[in-house]
């Protein structure tokens, strides 16, 4: 008698973009205009804002958030008509534990749908599934206690979920996403520029090591950081010049209460 293998394949059809150009990276082009545009982010599976230079670039660029969502998010129009009914967990939270093909013994966390809690498991290091988090906190914020954004539609997207942490002293809404604000960052009223310039540097969740720059609104300067290639936030620039050009103008110098520690 042969043993049947459980089908735990997690190729999430709903996560596939509708068009190949939706998988392209945001490309601001070589020009120097500063046009607010939107692109579909393959890693977060949502439409996000970026600054377009005004020429060249690629097809993954939209004038409105709505246009981006309609073009690149499968089933978006159906989802958008649903009434908001609180936070939902992404599909991958319900995938069974998969240690993957390799045996590297990495400590990871997954959401257990039986216990309704995030639990520790041993990941082999390659080719598991997306119910796999590097930290307990990350697992909890996405799968255990998803906090829904104050948005009129109920969209299940990664950035709708934020940490419900005790260290958060101030929250502000940026593009309908609740963003925890660090106490080291000046409050919103002291900054008149682009809201993402207030976000802390976020290295993301991938494997690359890319030199990037983020704007530190406490110092009014752009600093280098290591970006892993995907995820993260929009306070992420390929050059110091682009970073300063995008963020420097918004700081009201005499009102900044930020301190660098």
């Amino acid at each position: 008698l042969s043993e049947e293998a459980d089908d735990t394949d997690s190729e999430l059809g709903s996560m596939k973009p509708l068009h190949t150009f939706c998988a392209m990276k945001a490309d601001d082009g070589p020009c120097k205009a500063m046009i607010r545009s939107y692109f579909f982010n393959m890693y977060t599976h949502q439409c996000e804002e970026f600054i377009y230079g005004g020429c060249e670039g690629n097809e993954n660029r939209f004038d409105t958030l709505e246009e981006c969502k309609k073009t690149c998010i499968p089933g978006y129009e159906k989802t958008a008509v649903k009434a908001a009914s609180g936070a939902e967990r992404p599909d991958f939270c319900f995938l069974e534990e998969d240690p993957g093909l390799c045996r590297g013994y990495m400590k990871r966390y997954l959401y257990n749908n039986q216990t309704k809690q995030c639990e520790r498991f041993v990941y082999g290091g390659c080719l598991g599934n997306r119910n796999n988090f590097e930290t307990l906190d990350e697992c909890k914020k996405i799968c255990e206690n998803p906090v829904h954004s104050p948005s009129p539609v109920n969209e299940v997207q990664m950035s709708d979920y934020v940490t419900d942490g005790n260290t958060v002293t101030d929250r502000s809404t940026v593009n309908n996403i609740v963003v925890p604000q660090s106490p080291k960052v000046p409050r919103r009223r002291d900054y008149r520029g682009r809201p993402w310039c207030l976000q802390p540097a976020d290295s993301g969740l991938c494997k690359a090591s890319e030199r990037r720059f983020y704007y530190n609104s406490a110092t009014g300067k752009c600093h280098r950081f290591n970006y892993t290639g995907c995820g993260g936030n929009n306070n992420n620039f390929t050059t110091r010049r682009r970073c300063l050009r995008s963020c420097k103008t918004g700081l009201i110098k005499n009102k900044s209460k930020g301190v660098v520690k």
């Epitope: 459980d6 190729e11 093909l101």
Partner: antibody, heavy 123, light 112 residues
Framework: QVQLQQSGPGLVKPSQTLSLTCAIS??????????WSWIRQSPGRGLEWLGI?????????RYAVSVKSRITINPDTSKNQFSLQLNSVTPEDTAVYYC?????????????WGQGTLVTVSS | DIVMTQSPLSLPVTPGEPASISCRSS???????????LNWYLQKPGQSPQLLIY???NRASGVPDRFSGSGSGTDFTLKISRVEAEDVGVYYC?????????FGQGTKVEIK
């Protein structure tokens, strides 16, 4: 030394099921330090991974989306082998089919391959 | 799917001379601990593929030290320091960063 010996028909009629077996010696299909895969090669498509099975606390499998609705890979622990079944074949499925062992411990790669079986889909 | 693109597709070589094959992936294959999720295989004429280089730069057992793998992010290279007649065949890169596992289209190395 791990050896993989493939067996199965070389000619399959369109709409029928392609069935191949890979017998393992020098390792166990239930080993938690390996995984077992089928890969095919055709002039038009090059090397194409079809699917894989592996045993950890239980059996897992993963399949390529291109064949997901038609493929089954099963372990047979009593005979220490694993099999490929591909339903509703068309001439497009004509290829050399390989079974391969994935080393989960050290190399993280396909370190042993079967001899290959040329399967022609034709009436 | 991660697309693996090799170049050149054909590489005529002279025995004793070096050779280099490039493989580019459509997304990064390097984990933050430095592990590279990329392997190289050689398929000699009339044979099954054999593992040559694993995790980007490690030689599989029995592979001569004239073979070396390098690269980071999305760009990878297989080098043969001095080509020998037995090195002819088709070389493939393969990623295992995410499903489905994908291979490059192959580079055919032949003696001039």
């Amino acid at each position: 030394q791990v050896q993989l010996q493939q067996s199965g028909p070389g000619l399959v009629k369109p709409s029928q099921t392609l069935s191949l077996t890979c017998a393992i010696s020098g390792d166990s299909v239930s080993s938690d330090s390996a995984a077992w895969s089928w890969i095919r090669q055709s002039p038009g498509r090059g090397l194409e991974w079809l699917g894989i099975i592996y045993k950890r606390s239980k059996w897992y499998n993963r399949y390529a989306v291109s064949v997901k609705s038609r493929i089954t890979i099963n372990p047979d622990t009593s005979k220490n082998q694993f099999s490929l079944q591909l339903n509703s074949v068309t001439p497009e499925d004509t290829a050399v089919y390989y079974c391969a062992r994935w080393d989960s411990d050290k190399m993280w790669g396909f370190d042993d391959w079967g001899q290959g079986t040329l399967v022609t889909v034709s009436s | 799917d991660i697309v693996m693109t090799q170049s050149p597709l054909s590489l005529p070589v002279t025995p004793g001379e070096p050779a280099s094959i490039s493989c580019r992936s459509s997304q990064s294959l390097v984990f933050r601990d430095g592990t590279t999720y990329l392997n190289w295989y050689l398929q000699k004429p009339g044979q099954s593929p054999q593992l040559l280089i694993y995790k980007g730069s490690n030689r599989a057992s029995g592979v001569p030290d004239r073979f070396s793998g390098s690269g980071s992010g999305t760009d990878f290279t297989l080098k043969i320091s001095r080509v020998e007649a037995e090195d002819v065949g088709v070389y493939y890169c393969q990623q295992y960063d995410s499903y489905p596992l994908t291979f490059g289209q192959g580079t055919k190395v032949e003696i001039k």
